[in-house]
Interface confidence: medium
């Protein structure tokens, strides 16, 4: 496997008081293979609220690379292929659990972390505020 | 703490051969506060590809309950509020990490698992296959 420079301050994995710590097997089981999901590969281009994917990399995190969606337009694409600003493209956000090395560079010690990522975009009717 | 019936086959957390096992601090750190996220609260109703949330429960998994998006229509909602079948509502899927008790009923032994969840729906132009 990968050799990670070890931080001398790494916690003792046998320390019974290591806070709220459990043993986690990182041979990640992927439940998705049975369902044979059709990856939403080209939806980002075909959507009426298209998006671009941006790479976010952090070597101290697992997974190290996360792709983030950014909506291409404020409005949505209409039947003529033009942007209709009477509608809004908005990101669909989702929290994901990631593992962060803690302390940094410790090969066998992690903390679970929640981060918010934008997965894709959807087209919504705007909320119109009427001024009295 | 909680009294959990313990499986006698639980792995020894000090077993050096326990496969690819790491210590994980489950005090989940929330990185989302800095970005001040606005929850995409009502997008599921306001979207031109609206969706419902369905409950999926598994007591051996954390989080035990996952709410999955299911697109309400095959088509998308047009400006008149009707379903336009010339467009398609499709689910945006994302892999998330969950923890599974392994073996079951062991209080401090888990396996990371990747599952594919539908987060919401987007409206796409259909792929039309022309038959010669």
């Amino acid at each position: 496997g990968i050799t990670i420079p070890r931080n001398p301050g790494c916690p003792n994995s046998e320390d019974k008081n290591f806070p709220r710590t459990v043993m986690v097997n990182l041979n990640i089981h992927n439940r998705n293979t049975n369902t044979n999901p059709k990856r939403s590969s080209d939806y980002y281009n075909r959507s009426t609220s298209p998006w671009n994917l941006h790479r976010n990399e952090d070597p101290e995190r697992y997974p190290s690379v996360i792709w983030e969606a950014k909506c291409r337009h404020l409005g949505c694409i209409n039947a003529d292929g033009n942007v209709d600003y009477h509608m809004n493209s908005v990101p669909i956000q989702q929290e994901i659990l990631v593992l962060r090395r803690e302390p940094p560079h410790c090969p066998n010690s992690f903390r679970l972390e929640k981060i918010l990522v934008s997965v894709g975009c959807t087209c919504v009717t705007p909320i119109v505020h009427h001024v009295a | 703490g909680i009294t959990i019936p313990r499986n006698p086959g639980c792995p020894n957390s000090e077993d050096k051969n326990f496969p690819r096992t790491v210590m994980v601090n489950l005090n989940i750190h929330n990185r989302n506060t800095n970005t001040n996220p606005k929850r995409s609260s009502d997008y599921y109703n306001r979207s031109t590809s609206p969706w419902n949330l369905h409950r999926n429960e598994d007591p051996e998994r954390y989080p035990s309950v996952i709410w999955e998006a299911k697109c309400r229509h095959l088509g998308c909602i047009n400006a008149d509020g009707n379903v336009d079948y010339h467009m398609n509502s499709v689910p945006i899927q994302q892999e998330i990490l969950v923890l599974r008790r392994e073996p079951p009923h062991c209080p401090n032994s888990f396996r990371l698992e990747k599952i594919l969840v539908s987060v919401g729906c987007t409206c796409v132009t259909p792929i039309v296959h022309h038959v010669a």
Partner: antibody
Framework: EVQLVQSGAEVKKPGESLKVSCKAS????????ISWVRQAPGQGLEWMGG????????DYAQKFQGRVTITADESTTTAYMELSGLTSDDTAVYYC???????????????????WGQGTTVTVSS | EIVLTQSPDFQSVAPKEKVTITCRAS??????LHWYQQKPDQSPKLLIK???HSVSGVPSRFSGSGSGTDFTLTINGLEAEDAGTYYC?????????FGQGTKVDIK
């Protein structure tokens, strides 16, 4: 829907201990946590602590640290709150509340209290 | 700890009128704010979760808005059964805290 039924009213003397139970029914016990919230007469709500049933974790408000113990028994789907060293300031209604652990609308774990017990009135008086 | 301050402390409102209760957090809490209703001699009841999400079984006249530090609970068209005390609650960090409560009575 989850229902939480608490033990009955108690009258205690200063210095004594209190143990309140909260029996859950109508849902998988492991899929949520139980928090304890108290309300002194005419006052607002005060969170004391809680337990995450899936992991067996407990969290306590610093004010009650060392004096409160929250436990749960999965086999009987019952949570308990024990408070020691009672004083007259502990006179209150004690509530248990369900805290779901869910991945909902794109977010991990919801920490709202979506179901409450009926409350247990505790009077501490010499 | 995060302090939640509600205003007003008390409100007397006529039926069918609009009620607005605000909750201010001492620091940014994103949208981790929930609203509860407590009627006299009853347990609290969840009304709105995560600032603006409606809860099953709660009348649509109850709505919530806001994020960051400023939040609002609105009752559009007060009904007699809405009399009680309303609390906000933050769940972004421990210890969980509640606002001091806003008592609403019917004129």
């Amino acid at each position: 829907e989850v229902q939480l039924v608490q033990s009955g009213a108690e009258v205690k003397k200063p210095g004594e201990s209190l143990k309140v139970s909260c029996k859950a029914s109508g849902g998988r016990f492991r899929t949520y946590g139980i928090s304890w919230v108290r309300q002194a007469p005419g006052q607002g709500l005060e969170w004391m602590g809680g337990i995450t049933n899936f992991f067996g974790w407990t969290d306590y408000a610093q004010k009650f640290q060392g004096r409160v113990t929250i436990t749960a028994d999965e086999s009987t789907t019952t949570a308990y709150m024990e408070l020691s060293g009672l004083t007259s300031d502990d006179t209150a209604v004690y509530y248990c509340a369900r805290e779901p652990n869910e991945f909902w609308n794109g977010y991990y774990t919801t920490h709202d209290f979506d179901s409450w017990g009926q409350g247990t009135t505790v009077t501490v008086s010499s | 700890e995060i302090v939640l301050t509600q205003s007003p402390d008390f409100q007397s409102v006529a039926p069918k009128e609009k009620v607005t209760i605000t909750c201010r957090a001492s620091q940014n809490i994103g949208s981790e704010l929930h609203w509860y209703q407590q009627k006299p001699d009853q347990s609290p009841k969840l009304l709105i979760k995560y600032a603006s999400h409606s809860v099953s079984g709660v009348p649509s006249r109850f709505s919530g808005s806001g994020s960051g530090t400023d939040f609002t609970l609105t009752i559009n068209g007060l009904e007699a059964e809405d009399a009680g005390t309303y609390y906000c609650h933050q769940s972004i960090s421990l210890p969980y805290t509640f606002g001091q409560g806003t008592k609403v009575d019917i004129k």
